[in-house]
């Protein structure tokens, strides 16, 4: 039997990836981070 039409069974969540660099002071250089959906992961 052919399958009846249905959408895919999962929902795709679109998230924004934001790379940022922050100057933290004279002797400490910079922090480079990756923010995914509002959470810093690197």
């Amino acid at each position: 039997d052919a399958e009846f039409r249905h959408d895919s069974g999962y929902e795709v969540h679109h998230q924004k990836l934001v790379f940022f660099a922050e100057d933290v002071g004279s002797n400490k250089g910079a922090i480079i981070g990756l923010m995914v959906g509002g959470v810093v992961i690197a």
């Epitope: 039997d1 052919a2 399958e3 009846f4 039409r5 249905h6 959408d7 069974g9 999962y10 929902e11």
Partner: antibody, heavy 123, light 112 residues
Framework: QVTLKESGPALVKPTQTLTLTCTLS??????????VGWIRQPPGKALEWLAH???????SYNPSLKSRLTISKDTSKNQVVLTMTNMDPVDTATYYC???????????????WGQGTTVTVSS | DVVMTQSPLSLPVTPGEPASISCRSS???????????LEWYLQKPGQSPQLLIY???NRFSGVPDRFSGSGSGTDFTLKISRVEAEDVGVYYC?????????FGQGTKLEIK
């Protein structure tokens, strides 16, 4: 509110063609994911699925009746039409239309039904 | 075709008591998208069918929480925790995974 209403002849003769109309209100068949199907129920018997049409004109038929059925839509009138050729007394039944909508946030089940229209096939 | 077999076909129940209806499909109704499209409809006397449960276990809006659905693969169950007089009618299981879409033969629930 969402309503569906079936209309058509109460009596048809054997070998004739039946034309049924389902008029929709409270929602539009042109909405992405929207679909309408037809189901029938002979007196005192179980339900039988006949056909379904989607907003994009994709159609599905019950293979056992496919040669006799045509489902179509008139988006401007918000109507779905089912024709069944070569009617026979065994086609005597109440015919229902029902709504079904695809989508990850949709029920994806027949959530609204019409009240049904009774068709008798007799000479 | 996927044959849906319900049992029992007749179900007399005392108000306030639980009730259970079984529905078995002749083959798996797991769709390729990962969902199982098993639905339950109730047809009250003289009325059109109405949706109770979709995708095995999800209650439709407005359906009392005494109704619950469960199962997987080919074996499904509708349970009513405490039957009320307004629950009388014919209950149909229905699969919409494969064409043709098919109903069970119906279970008639009546009050003792």
């Amino acid at each position: 509110q969402v309503t569906l209403k079936e209309s058509g002849p109460a009596l048809v003769k054997p070998t004739q063609t039946l034309t049924l109309t389902c008029t929709l209100s409270g929602f539009s068949l042109s909405t992405s994911g929207m679909g309408v199907g037809w189901i029938r129920q002979p007196p005192g018997k179980a339900l039988e699925w006949l056909a379904h049409i989607w907003w994009d004109d994709d159609k599905s038929y019950n293979p056992s009746l496919k040669s006799r059925l045509t489902i179509s839509k008139d988006t401007s009138k918000n109507q779905v039409v089912l024709t069944m050729t070569n009617m026979d007394p065994v086609d005597t039944a109440t015919y229902y239309c029902a709504r079904r909508q695809l989508g990850l946030r949709s029920i994806d089940a027949m959530d609204y039904w019409g009240q049904g229209t009774t068709v008798t096939v007799s000479s | 075709d996927v044959v849906m077999t319900q049992s029992p076909l007749s179900l007399p129940v005392t108000p306030g008591e639980p009730a259970s209806i079984s529905c078995r499909s002749s083959q798996s109704i797991l769709h390729s998208n990962g969902n199982t499209y098993l639905e339950w409809y109730l047809q009250k006397p003289g009325q059109s069918p109405q949706l109770l449960i979709y995708k095995v276990s999800n209650r439709f809006s407005g359906v009392p929480d005494r109704f619950s659905g469960s199962g997987s693969g080919t074996d499904f169950t509708l349970k009513i925790s405490r039957v009320e007089a307004e629950d009388v009618g014919v209950y149909y299981c229905f699969q919409s995974s494969r064409v043709p879409l098919t109903f069970g033969q119906g279970t008639k629930l009546e009050i003792k």
